[in-house]
């Protein structure tokens, strides 16, 4: 049941806990057949999703899937909050579920999640540091 | 072509802790998009969603059996075993594996032909 | 949770005629991505549920065309345009929507 349809590859409720001050990229999956569909990033202000337009974006490919990566070089306070990704594809916009970024400053490490808090969300752990991306704007 | 079954006792006493496996072919479990899911029907009853293992080890439980639901993936024997303590009489049903395809978010294309697990003394 | 309620809960059919299905949900299933998370199983006796439509309208592979699901929001239908011997059993409607995940209760379709 292989489908051409493009799929973006955030869960619901998808997190992500990092520090101010330190690199972090943002991925977007997406899986596509020939084409690869023009994705774009955009981060929530209530119900609007607001187009980032001058941030640093990549794309990796890998054997099966590709990733449209935001860049946060460095991730600064005001970069919490939730994103989303977005495909258009034959005329078609397809958007991901949203994904949030809870930034902790380190000012203020006492606001960091416990080891509980860790512990029942281990998807809180999951970040990724790749180099060697071809970086454009 | 996708199958999946499902093994485990079927007969446990009270208190006692169920493990279920689900055995499955056709995918593989560390692609992305793929998930399995663990679904219950008491006999003569409605179906209820238990909890879901995702491509990337992420899970999700029904809130109602949280504290009693362990669910874990081993992807090299294309497994996914599914845990429940301390079981009651009336948590006897049929214990389902599905997969979990992906159109945006899951949802289940194919299950397993379920096994029927009796609680009793 | 979101409760997902069917209506007839028993629905004697003649052979060779239309059947319907009604599936209402307490909250709007609409999703924020655009998508409506709402799918129908179908499980004759004796046998493991089976996938008949995914994403409200969408007809899983090897379903039958006689089969069609449509509606939005909180009010969902699935439809036999001609039903057949083989369409006896229990139909449940299910979201993806919202955590967890939940099944409507069952319609039993039988041949009067």
């Known amino acids: 049941k292989e489908s051409c349809d493009v799929q973006l590859y955030i869960k619901r409720q998808s997190e992500h806990s990092i520090l101010a001050g330190d690199p972090f990229e943002l991925e977007c999956p997406v899986k596509y057949c020939a084409n690869r569909p023009h994705v774009t990033w955009c981060k929530l202000n209530g119900t609007t999703c607001v187009k980032l337009e001058d941030r640093q974006t990549s794309w990796k490919e890998e054997k099966n899937i590709s990733f449209f990566i935001l860049h946060f070089e460095p991730v600064l306070p005001n970069d919490n909050g939730s994103y989303r990704c977005s495909a258009n594809f034959q005329s078609n916009l397809i958007e991901s579920h949203s994904t949030t970024l809870y930034v902790t400053d380190v000012k203020s490490a006492s606001e960091r999640p416990s080891k509980d808090e860790m512990a029942s969300r281990p998807w809180l752990l999951y970040r990724h540091h790749h180099h060697h991306h071809h970086h454009h704007h | 072509q996708i199958t999946l079954k499902e093994s485990g006792p079927t007969l446990v006493k009270p208190t006692q802790t169920l493990t279920l496996t689900c055995t499955f072919s056709g995918f593989s479990l560390s692609t992305f998009g793929m998930g399995v899911s663990w679904i219950r029907q008491p006999p003569g009853k409605a179906l209820e969603w238990l909890a879901h293992?995702?491509?990337?080890?992420?899970?999700r439980f029904n809130p109602s059996l949280k504290s009693r639901l362990t669910i874990t993936k081993d992807t090299s024997k294309n497994q996914v075993v599914l845990t429940m303590t301390n079981m009651d009489p009336v948590d006897t049903a049929t214990y389902y594996c599905?997969?979990?395809?992906?159109?945006?978010?899951?949802?289940?294309?194919?299950w397993g032909q379920g096994t029927l697990v009796t609680v009793s003394s | 949770d979101v409760v997902m309620t069917q209506s007839p809960l028993s629905l004697p059919v003649t052979l060779g005629q239309p059947a319907s299905i009604s599936c209402k949900s307490t909250?709007?299933?609409?999703?924020?991505?655009?998508?409506?998370?709402l799918n129908w199983f179908q499980q004759r006796p004796g046998q493991s549920p089976r996938s008949l439509i995914y994403l409200v309208s969408k007809l899983d592979s090897g379903v039958p065309d006689r089969f069609s699901g449509s509606g939005s929001g909180t009010d969902f239908t699935l439809k036999i345009s001609r039903v057949e011997a083989e369409d006896v059993g229990v139909y449940y409607c299910?979201?993806?929507?919202?955590?967890?995940?939940?099944f409507g209760q069952g319609t039993k379709v039988e041949i009067k």
């Open positions: 293992i995702y491509w990337d080890d992420d899970k």
């Open positions: 599905a997969h979990g395809n992906w159109d945006g978010e899951t949802y289940f294309d194919y």
């Open positions: 299910w979201q993806g929507t919202h955590f967890p995940w939940t």
């Open positions: 909250q709007s299933l609409l999703d924020s991505d655009g998508k409506t998370y």
